[in-house]
Every structure is written in structure tokens, then in C-alpha cells.
């Protein structure tokens, strides 16, 4: 059909925090790359009607469905989704096409369904149709990649067997300690399955998707370093497959490596030794353990030797299901106002856990550095001074650990006072949590010095928005008081801190407050 | 569960000798055993060792002094320390199957 005009339909995706329904809107925000979304005439619909390209969105993701029109004229258009109709601004480009979008901001199950574009031109009228879905992350996985050798070649493959299709890439490095961090230069990165450069000091592969990233380390002795302070261990799940990697360099190649299990040596099958002259032209052997599925009488420490360097060996245990190992006693701390302090848990687990901490309802977060001795570690130090209650959790395919914290920040206490016809009462959420007095001020004692005890009633209770506490005190009005002013004041080893009362009738309470460090 | 005792070490003049020694339990073969040392402020270095083809390696500056020896019946490694200098003054650390032993202090006075 000659009339038909040129239709350019596309899907922008935003970085964007706003939260809104779908609107129409004439400029979109900053993006990402347009994709084309095709949009193919229907066959046999009345009318002429184009699809997009099914759209599958993120929850709370951000985008615009957009189509460009190349047709003479001014051009008005119409969005109806689910019945409704929405207000429809085109505009037009640097090159003369109409541009009609619909901004989804923050896509909820709500704003999933069909959009239905009507356009009218000079020309002709046509429909266009988006059918916008929330993609099913609930049948995603990202699984910790694991290696394999490639058959009949000295190279190993790296897999992740994640859902959707993960990439997978090696991360090389070939410094010692600390200039082996992700984004050091001393790091290269390959994207790529199959690794056949097997010499380098440090060889990890990572898989990453849309729920995040995940790496294994290929488990490495190295003959030529001081063997480390702590036990080299290794754990593995029954099934999982163990790979141990002996490295070692010499001034010629009349040396051998050897592994063995407790004091056997590994069976034909389970190693394979590969060796290169390096830059200086001494030799380096490497020499792979493996077991393709372990079982638990694969448990055991594995060492290996060398005619020409110290053995070295590492404990291997295989276990049933996976682990966490912490202690999980609820700790308290006190600090002053502008101390620095971090909380931290220590913990030994497999698989690596996934954590977070969480304070206030709200959730950080939570990083983990591994030690030296097969212990991992978090930290938090973001509580910026805040008391209450912090909590870590961790957990992994097979096992949940839960720890509570308990910070106190020393301070001075604040007082606020209310009254009713019947009573008077002052909190405070100073800490250590304050004593408190209540004095009479009168003719006899302008200096309010005259000390209340009866009626009067103290209390702690838990402000459970922040699991902090609040110290309050109850002063029952009695005839004795009725009229006169009383003084509260709470105090502990940082200060004091007083309001004044006035008790009369019912009413608006004037208080005056007065503080004494 | 695998277990180093250390013995031996002190105070010695230099040029005179010294005798550690290192029974092991839960080890199978004395030979996956070897002697560090660390020095204040350095990093721990290797002393002497065992090969697995049965034969014996020494760090650079104990070669021609220092003998590393294995009783297996007992499992035991002993490290013989001749011709002592003030140089060779660290805490020495026996080494097998992933484990230390807790350390022995070796001071030599010139």
C-alpha cells in the first residue's frame, strides 16, 4: 500500500530513580541505546495495525516505548491502555518524523499489558501495538561457575550453569597480594569460556547475569612461596568437582611435582601436568589435581611435592550440605558521639553467602573480605551515630545466620516534658540511660531545691522504631503540687538536663527548659 | 588431627651449635616436613627441607652448617645447627601437612 507511512518502533531502557505511572511525554529522559522493536504490519486485522516486538521489563525499571513517523503532515495521536485513554504529545525530530513516546517509569505488574497507539495523518489512520511484560526473574539463577577440562587439550573451561545464559569470563592476574584486586592494572580480563594460559599466579572465573556476579578461584600452591601461616583449606559439596592447582618454578626442568591424598598418590586420571620456560628461561610446572564429582572419601589434606622445593599441602573436606560458622550471640556496644567503630562478624562459609545489614527497616549494603585463615569478614560502619539496633544476615543455598548488634551512643540526656489534668511526665533517650528527680519550686524554695518523691513513677521503654531506649518519669499530680511549678531532671555521668512544669488546670503546659551540663 | 611439638633452642655464643627437634602426630611421612625461621621485622624464610624423592634442601645462607634429619619410626625432624652466627638469631618454626609448630627461640650472641 503506497499510502502507508515509514514506522519506526523502539524500546529505550533508563538508569533512573523516580518513581511514577506511564505517561506520555514528548522528551524522554537520558538513556540507554534504542532498540527496534521491529514493528511489522498484522496480517489479516481490519484496519491497519503494526506490532512491536514483544517488550519484557525489569520490575521497577524505567523505559519508553517510542515510535517515529515518517509521514507527510501534521500527525495526532492516542494512547489507550486497559480501556483508558492517556493524553498523547508527538513531536517532531531534526528530521522531520514524527515522534510519539510512552515513558513507563519504576514498571510494576500494573503497567504490564498491551498499549495500543491510534495515529491519525493526513493520510491515513493505523494502530500500533506494544505488548509490555514483566520479565519471570523468579526462574533466574546465577550458579558459582566450576571448571572442567577440555577433552584431549591442556585447557580449562570454565561453566555456570545460570539461567539466563551467564557471560562468563577469566580474570587473570600475575602480581602477589594486594595488586591483584579486581580493578588493579595488574588484572586482565577475558571473555571467553576456555582458558589454555594456565601459568599465571592467580586465576579466577566469574559468570555474571541479571542478578549479579559470581566467582571461583582456582584453588593454587604455590611451591615457590613460604607456605601461608593458616591451614589452606578447600571445602566442597558432595558431587561438586575439585580442582587443586601446584605451580612451581625452577632453574631447569629436572624437577618433578607430585600430589598426593593423606599418603597415596593420586590415581592416573585424577592430575595432569603441563610446564613452560618462562621469560628468563627457568621452568615452571603446574600440576593439576582433580576429582570430576567428590565424594566424602575424597576428604583429606592434599600435598604436593617436588624434587627441588619444600612440600606443601591443604586440607580438602568435603561436606554434605553447606555451612555458616559464626557466633551468633546478640553483642552491645557504647561509644561516644564522634568515635569511630564498625561493627564486624567473622564467619567460615560454603558456599560464599550472600548478606545484608539492616537498621531502621532499611537495608545496607553488606560487603565481605576474605583472611588469611579460611575466615571471611563484614564490616559496617555506616550507622552514622545512629543508637538502636543493627542486625546482619547471611545466608547460602544450604544454611541462614542471623546476628544482632546493639549500639549506644554515650550522650548527655535531652529532656521532653507533657502534662495532663492528672499528671506530669518527662522522657529522655540519653545514654547511659538517666536517673531522675523531680523538684517543687516555691516561696520557700525559689531555687526549686525542695526534692518530690511521692507520686512519682520511672520507666524504660523500648522506641522500637530504632530498638533504642527511652527512659521516662511520671510525676501524679496531688493538691500538695497542683499550681506550682515542678522541675525534672534527668542526669547521668554525661550531664543533666531539666524542664520545667507548671501545674494547673487542664490546658496548653508552658515548659521551660533549662540545661545543666 | 595433625600436631607439631617443638623443642630445643636458647641462647647460644656464635659458633657454637644447637639441636631442634619436631615430633609429629597425625603425619604419615616425615619427608612432608620442613624448618622455617623468621627474623624480627622479615618474612619467614625457608631453612631446610625434604624432597619427594627423598633427598634434603637448604636455604641459601645455612647450606654447609645446618643439617635437617627424619626419624620415621618416630616422627620425628630434627634440625642440627653448627657454626651458629648472630645472623641465624629468629624464631624457628617447624612445618608439615598445612601446620606449624608453635615456634622456638633461637638467639645467638656474638
Known amino acids: 500500500n503506497q499510502d502507508l507511512p515509514v514506522i519506526k518502533c523502539v524500546l529505550i531502557n533508563h538508569k533512573n530513580n523516580d518513581s511514577s505511572v506511564g505517561k506520555s511525554s514528548s522528551y524522554p529522559m537520558v538513556s540507554e541505546s534504542p532498540e527496534d522493536l521491529g514493528c511489522a504490519l498484522r496480517p489479516q486485522s481490519s484496519g491497519t495495525v503494526y506490532e512491536a516486538a514483544a517488550v519484557e521489563v525489569d520490575v521497577s525499571a524505567s523505559i519508553t516505548l517510542q515510535v517515529l513517523v515518517d509521514a507527510p503532515g501534521n500527525i495526532s495521536c492516542l494512547w489507550v491502555f486497559k480501556h483508558s485513554s492517556l493524553n498523547c504529545q508527538p513531536h517532531f525530530d531534526l528530521q522531520n518524523r514524527g515522534v510519539v513516546s510512552m515513558v513507563i517509569l519504576k514498571m510494576t505488574e500494573t503497567q504490564a499489558g498491551e498499549y495500543l497507539l491510534f495515529i491519525q495523518s493526513e493520510a491515513t489512520n493505523y494502530t500500533i501495538l506494544f505488548t509490555v511484560s514483566i520479565r519471570n526473574t523468579l526462574l533466574y539463577t546465577l550458579r558459582r561457575p566450576y571448571f572442567r577440562k577440555m577433552e584431549n587439550q591442556d585447557a580449562l573451561v570454565c561453566i555456570s550453569e545460570s539461567v539466563p545464559e551467564p557471560i562468563v569470563e577469566w580474570v587473570l592476574c600475575d602480581s602477589q597480594g594486594e595488586s591483584c584486586k579486581e580493578e588493579s592494572p595488574a588484572v586482565v580480563k577475558k571473555e571467553e569460556k576456555v582458558l589454555h594460559e594456565l601459568f599465571g599466579t592467580d586465576i579466577r572465573c566469574c559468570a555474571r547475569n541479571e542478578l549479579g556476579r559470581e566467582c571461583t578461584r582456582l584453588f593454587t600452591i604455590d611451591l615457590n612461596q613460604t607456605p601461608q601461616t593458616t591451614l589452606p583449606q578447600l571445602f566442597l559439596k558432595v558431587g561438586e568437582p575439585l580442582w587443586i592447582r601446584c605451580k612451581a618454578v625452577h632453574v631447569n626442568h629436572g624437577f618433578g611435582l607430585t600430589w598426593e591424598l593423606e599418603n597415596k598418590a593420586l590415581e592416573e586420571g585424577n592430575y595432569f601436568e603441563m610446564s613452560t620456560y618462562s621469560t628468563n628461561r627457568t621452568m615452571i610446572r603446574i600440576l593439576f589435581a582433580f576429582v570430576s564429582s567428590v565424594a566424602r572419601n575424597d576428604t583429606g589434606y592434599y600435598t604436593c611435592s617436588s624434587s627441588k622445593h619444600p612440600s606443601q599441602s591443604a586440607l580438602v573436606t568435603i561436606v554434605e550440605k553447606g555451612f555458616i560458622n559464626a557466633t551468633n550471640s546478640s553483642e552491645d556496644y557504647e561509644i561516644d558521639q564522634y568515635e569511630e567503630f564498625c561493627f564486624s562478624v567473622r564467619f567460615k562459609a560454603y558456599p560464599q553467602i550472600r548478606c545484608t545489614w539492616t537498621f531502621s527497616r532499611k537495608s545496607f549494603p553488606c560487603e565481605q573480605k576474605g583472611l588469611d585463615n579460611g575466615y571471611s569478614i563484614s564490616k559496617f560502619c555506616n550507622h552514622k551515630h545512629q543508637p538502636g539496633e543493627y542486625i546482619f544476615h547471611a545466608e547460602n543455598d544450604d544454611a541462614q545466620f542471623t546476628k544482632m548488634f546493639t549500639l549506644n551512643i554515650r550522650r548527655k540526656p535531652q529532656v521532653l516534658a507533657e502534662a495532663s489534668a492528672s499528671q506530669a511526665s518527662c522522657f529522655s533517650d540519653g545514654y547511659p540511660l538517666p536517673s531522675w528527680t523531680w523538684k517543687k519550686c516555691s516561696d520557700k524554695s525559689p531555687n526549686c531545691t525542695e526534692e518530690i518523691t511521692e507520686g512519682v513513677w520511672n520507666r524504660k521503654a523500648n522506641r522500637k522504631v530504632f530498638g533504642q531506649w527511652v527512659s521516662s518519669s511520671t510525676l501524679n499530680m496531688s493538691e500538695a503540687i497542683k499550681g506550682f511549678l515542678v522541675k525534672c531532671c534527668a542526669y547521668n555521668s554525661l550531664g543533666t538536663s531539666c524542664e520545667t512544669i507548671l501545674l494547673n488546670s487542664p490546658g496548653p503546659f508552658p515548659f521551660i527548659q533549662d540545661n545543666i551540663s | 588431627q595433625v600436631q607439631l611439638q617443638q623443642s630445643g633452642g636458647g641462647l647460644v655464643q656464635a659458633g657454637g651449635s644447637l639441636r631442634l627437634s619436631c615430633a609429629a602426630s597425625g603425619i604419615f611421612k616425615t619427608n612432608y616436613m620442613a624448618w622455617y625461621r623468621q627474623a624480627p621485622g622479615k618474612q619467614r624464610e625457608l631453612v631446610a627441607a625434604?624432597?619427594?624423592?627423598?633427598?634434603?634442601l637448604y636455604g641459601d645462607s645455612v647450606k654447609g652448617r645446618f643439617t635437617i634429619s627424619r626419624d620415621d619410626a618416630k616422627y620425628t625432624v630434627s634440625l642440627q645447627m653448627n657454626s651458629l652466627k648472630p645472623e641465624d638469631t629468629a624464631v624457628y618454626y617447624c612445618?608439615?601437612?598445612?601446620?606449624w609448630g608453635q615456634g622456638t627461640q633461637v638467639i645467638v650472641s656474638s
Open positions: 625434604f624432597t619427594n624423592d627423598g633427598s634434603t
Open positions: 612445618y608439615g601437612l598445612g601446620h
